[in-house]
């Protein structure tokens, strides 16, 4: 039985050219995690292997930094970074929890940190 | 099996600069941060920073910025911390540690510095 | 910055007694919450990763638990050997920050 429960930064907003931390946190479970995902849309950014460390895909290497913890710090933010990331924890023995950000590029200097939510 | 061979001891004047160096092995050092963590004699553990080999990413302590500056030489699998204007306050044990998201897993054995005139 | 405060400062312990060391956090950290121990004249050694994630080669004896701010590293029967300093660390934002320590010592 999956007990665990997501936390995610939620709906969140930030400037053109400026960074912005994408955060997942697993909680009210016992269970392993081996591996997460970080995913843009069907595009993956990184993985961070409880094993192997971390593996950037290529094409994000010179703008993502891994952290803090098991989250990644996107940076020099573009409109087209707009859309929905996913954070895909793999644990033994519960299996995959999946939380959902959704981030908007704002050209302004009106962006806000949206509220935490929950993914039971 | 990963290991983490720190450069040894070091005994400096006030002023000077400093460079050690941790040398990673067993793993690949551009899938981990390296974290640098400070020991003063009797004291806790405090956070300097952290460099990530794999893009040159690196995170400061504020209260370290200007003081400790992070490198690495992905082709040496070597991180370095160069201290500046040495006084007695920086007279501690410095400690490389790497972080793959996970905790900090591996430490090297520390570098004692003396700064002393 | 996210202050980690340790209690208490120092535990006096009979080997076989069971112990508990508390850490609380300034602002809500989730489960980023790392205990590490420390033997004299040693480098710190990961414990219990993310509140309560046991580490392979630690013994089973050390547990964590907690979420939030309040988070607590357990010892069922401590052994000579388990004597020295404990940290904990959080990995929820930069900076990493450590709590100040837990001695435990022998009473």
């Known amino acids: 039985m999956m007990t665990g429960t997501i936390e995610t930064t939620g709906n969140i907003s930030a400037e053109k050219g400026g960074s912005i931390i994408l955060q997942c946190h697993l909680s009210s479970t016992t269970a392993q995690v081996t591996q997460v995902n970080w995913e843009q849309q069907d595009q993956l950014l990184a993985i961070c292997n409880a094993d192997l460390g971390w593996h950037i895909s290529p094409s994000f290497k010179d703008r993502v930094a891994p952290g803090p913890g098991l989250g990644l710090t996107l940076q020099s933010l573009t409109v087209n970074d707009t859309g929905e990331y996913f954070c895909i924890y793999h644990t033994y023995p519960d299996g995959t929890y999946t939380g959902r950000i959704f981030l908007e590029v704002l050209e302004s200097s009106v962006a806000e940190h949206g509220a935490r939510f929950q993914i039971p | 099996e990963v290991q983490l061979q720190q450069s040894g001891t070091v005994l400096a004047r006030p002023g000077a600069s400093v460079k050690m160096s941790c040398k990673a092995s067993g793993y690949s050092i551009t899938s981990y941060w390296m974290h640098w963590v400070k020991q003063r004699p009797g004291q806790g553990l405090e956070w300097i920073g952290g460099?990530?080999?794999?893009?040159?990413?690196?995170n400061y302590n504020q209260k370290f910025k200007g003081k400790a500056k992070l490198t690495a030489v992905t082709s040496a699998s070597t991180a370095y911390m160069e201290l500046s204007s040495l006084t007695n306050e920086d007279s501690a044990v410095y400690y490389c540690?790497?972080?793959?998201?996970?905790?900090?897993?591996?430490w090297g054995q520390g570098t004692s510095v003396t700064v002393s005139s | 910055d996210v202050v980690l405060t340790q209690s208490p400062a120092t535990l006096s312990v009979t080997p076989g007694d069971s112990v508990s060391l508390s850490c609380r956090a300034s602002q809500t950290i989730s489960n980023n919450l790392h205990w590490y121990q420390q033997k004299s004249h040693e480098s710190p050694r990961l414990l219990i990763k993310?509140?309560?994630q046991s580490i392979s080669g630690i013994p089973s004896r050390f547990s964590g638990s907690g979420s939030g701010t309040d988070f607590t590293l357990s010892i069922n029967s401590v052994e000579t050997e388990d004597f020295g300093m404990y940290f904990c660390q959080q990995s929820y934002s930069w900076p990493y920050t450590f709590g100040g320590g837990t001695k435990l010592e022998i009473k």
């Open positions: 460099v990530y080999p794999g893009n040159s990413n690196t």
């Open positions: 993310y509140s309560s």
């Open positions: 540690t790497r972080e793959g998201g996970y905790g900090m897993d591996y």
